[in-house]
């Protein structure tokens, strides 16, 4: 017992999604060592040299980092002593999609597990009565997606109902060229009921969901993360 | 807590060089980007570039690239920036500034206080 | 290399008013963006970092908020000690570049 090397410890990682542009987190886990220096933490990318980040005796170790992470990385270096091998990474890039594995060592043994890492864009919708159109409307809205998504609307009173021909989808390229802003407008809408905007795209499901009534409007909105988990 | 602590004022003639240091203390220096910036008078702040204690790593703004050298020694905890060919425009406050997020390089929280290089003949 | 055009280059305002200070960022769409407080003579301060998170022992009234390419600082009701310089910062890429500041005076 406790020869480095000589057993497996177990590493956890999660399947996770990265939204371009915001920080990001590559999720790991293992089992707790008190003792800090003994501790070694590797995270490497398929198909680049060099490391993308290490941690060693208590610090960041920087020297074979891979130039494309320079800056970008670090571990939550208070929680390592209780397991936590995750990283942070700043300014997702597309590039940074692919299969990453998390190498631990301490002084129980050693493992190792792979992620899948996504990155694209994805953001809440709002949805908003349109006034200004010639009938009742509803508009929703998402800033930020990436690859573009698909667009669908449902309602409570008109369950599998199918909007397609009452709506109209707009996506529009925002500055930095890359992530599209979504426009959905759905027609003739009627009051006491609850509509719903749903955006989907292989990384992530946005739903807006809006109800109108005489005297109010209420609106909610949830973004789910598809494929995350172990 | 952080504290960082610079040299004294300089007073230089143009086409000289001018080494400002930046003593660090209150934490793990090798573990933080600093990063250097600086004011004119009267004029708004600067970017003039960073360095990553624990490798030696640097970054420097377009405008002050072949002029400007930034450096560190780990066993003083100590960062420094030295202007070459120095003009009477390179006259200005200079600052450093650790970088929050340690090797993730974030924004600058905690400042020195500043060291006034002055241009002149 | 991003710029950051930051206005307006000075505002006059009074104790309570509510002030507004944008930045336009030149190209690109990251949250890496920094908002500081100056007074004559004194290092900058951080206020504001990653678009809207506030800094510890910051005062509630300061806020900021953006996305694409406009940010904005907040101070909701203005205190007799925020009269200074605010500038935005913008750091997601390697080269970091400030706004032209923004000097908040007395009416």
């Known amino acids: 017992f406790g020869i480095s090397g000589k057993h497996f410890i177990t590493v956890t990682t999660f399947t996770s999604a990265g939204n371009i542009g915001e920080d990001g987190t590559l999720s790991c886990t293992f089992e707790p060592d008190i003792k800090l220096n003994g501790i070694v933490i590797q995270w490497l990318k398929e198909g680049i040299k060099g490391l993308v980040h290490e941690f060693k005796e208590g610090k960041d170790d920087l020297s074979q980092q891979h130039e494309m992470f320079r800056g970008r990385t670090a571990v939550f270096a208070d929680q390592v002593v209780v397991g936590n091998a995750s990283l942070r990474l700043k300014n997702v890039q597309l590039t940074d999609a692919g299969t990453y594995t998390c190498y631990i060592r301490t002084s129980k043994g050693k493992g190792n597990a792979n992620l899948e890492y996504k990155t694209g864009a994805f953001s809440m919708p709002e949805i908003n009565v349109d006034y200004n159109a010639s009938s009742e409307s509803l508009r929703c809205e998402a800033p930020r997606w990436f690859p573009q998504p698909t667009v669908a609307w449902a309602s409570q009173v008109d369950q599998g109902a199918n909007f397609s021909e009452v709506s109209n989808t707009s996506f529009e390229l925002n500055s930095e060229n890359v992530t599209m802003k979504v426009v959905s407008v759905l027609y003739n809408v009627t009051i006491n009921n609850t509509y719903s905007c749903m955006i989907e795209n292989d990384i992530a499901k946005a739903t807006g969901d809006i109800k109108v009534t005489d005297s109010e409007v209420k609106r909610r909105s949830q973004l789910q993360l598809l494929n995350s988990g172990p | 807590e952080v504290q960082l602590v610079q040299s004294g004022a300089e007073v230089k003639k143009p086409g000289a060089s001018v080494k400002v240091s930046c003593k660090a203390s209150?934490?793990?220096?090798?573990?933080?980007?600093i990063g250097w910036v600086r004011q004119a008078p009267g004029q708004g702040l600067e970017w003039i570039g960073d360095?990553?204690?624990?490798?030696?790593?640097?970054n420097y703004n377009e405008k002050f690239k072949g002029r400007v050298t930034i450096t560190r020694d780990t066993s003083t905890s100590t960062a420094y920036l030295e202007l070459s060919s120095l003009r009477s425009e390179d006259t200005a406050v200079y600052y450093c500034?650790?970088?929050?997020?340690?090797?993730?390089?974030?924004?600058?929280?905690?400042w020195g206080q500043g060291t006034l290089v002055t241009v002149s003949s | 290399d991003i710029q950051m055009t930051q206005s307006p280059s000075s505002l006059s305002a009074s104790v309570g008013d509510r002030v507004t200070i944008t930045c336009k960022a030149s190209?690109?769409?990251?949250?890496?963006v920094a908002w500081y407080q100056q007074k004559p003579g004194k290092a900058p301060k951080l206020l504001i970092y990653?678009?809207?998170t506030l800094q510890p022992g910051v005062p509630s009234r300061f806020s900021g908020s953006g996305s694409g390419r406009d940010y904005t600082l907040t101070i909701s009701s203005l205190q007799p000690e925020d009269f200074a310089t605010y500038y935005c910062?913008?750091?997601?890429?390697?080269?970091?570049?400030f706004g032209q500041g923004t000097k908040v005076e007395i009416k």
């Open positions: 190209q690109g769409f990251n949250k890496y």
């Open positions: 990653y678009t809207s």
């Open positions: 910062l913008q750091y997601g890429n390697l080269l970091y570049a």
């Open positions: 500034a650790r970088l929050d997020g340690s090797s993730y390089r974030g924004a600058m929280d905690s």
């Open positions: 360095i990553y204690p624990g490798g030696g790593y640097t």
């Open positions: 209150g934490y793990t220096f090798t573990s933080y980007w």
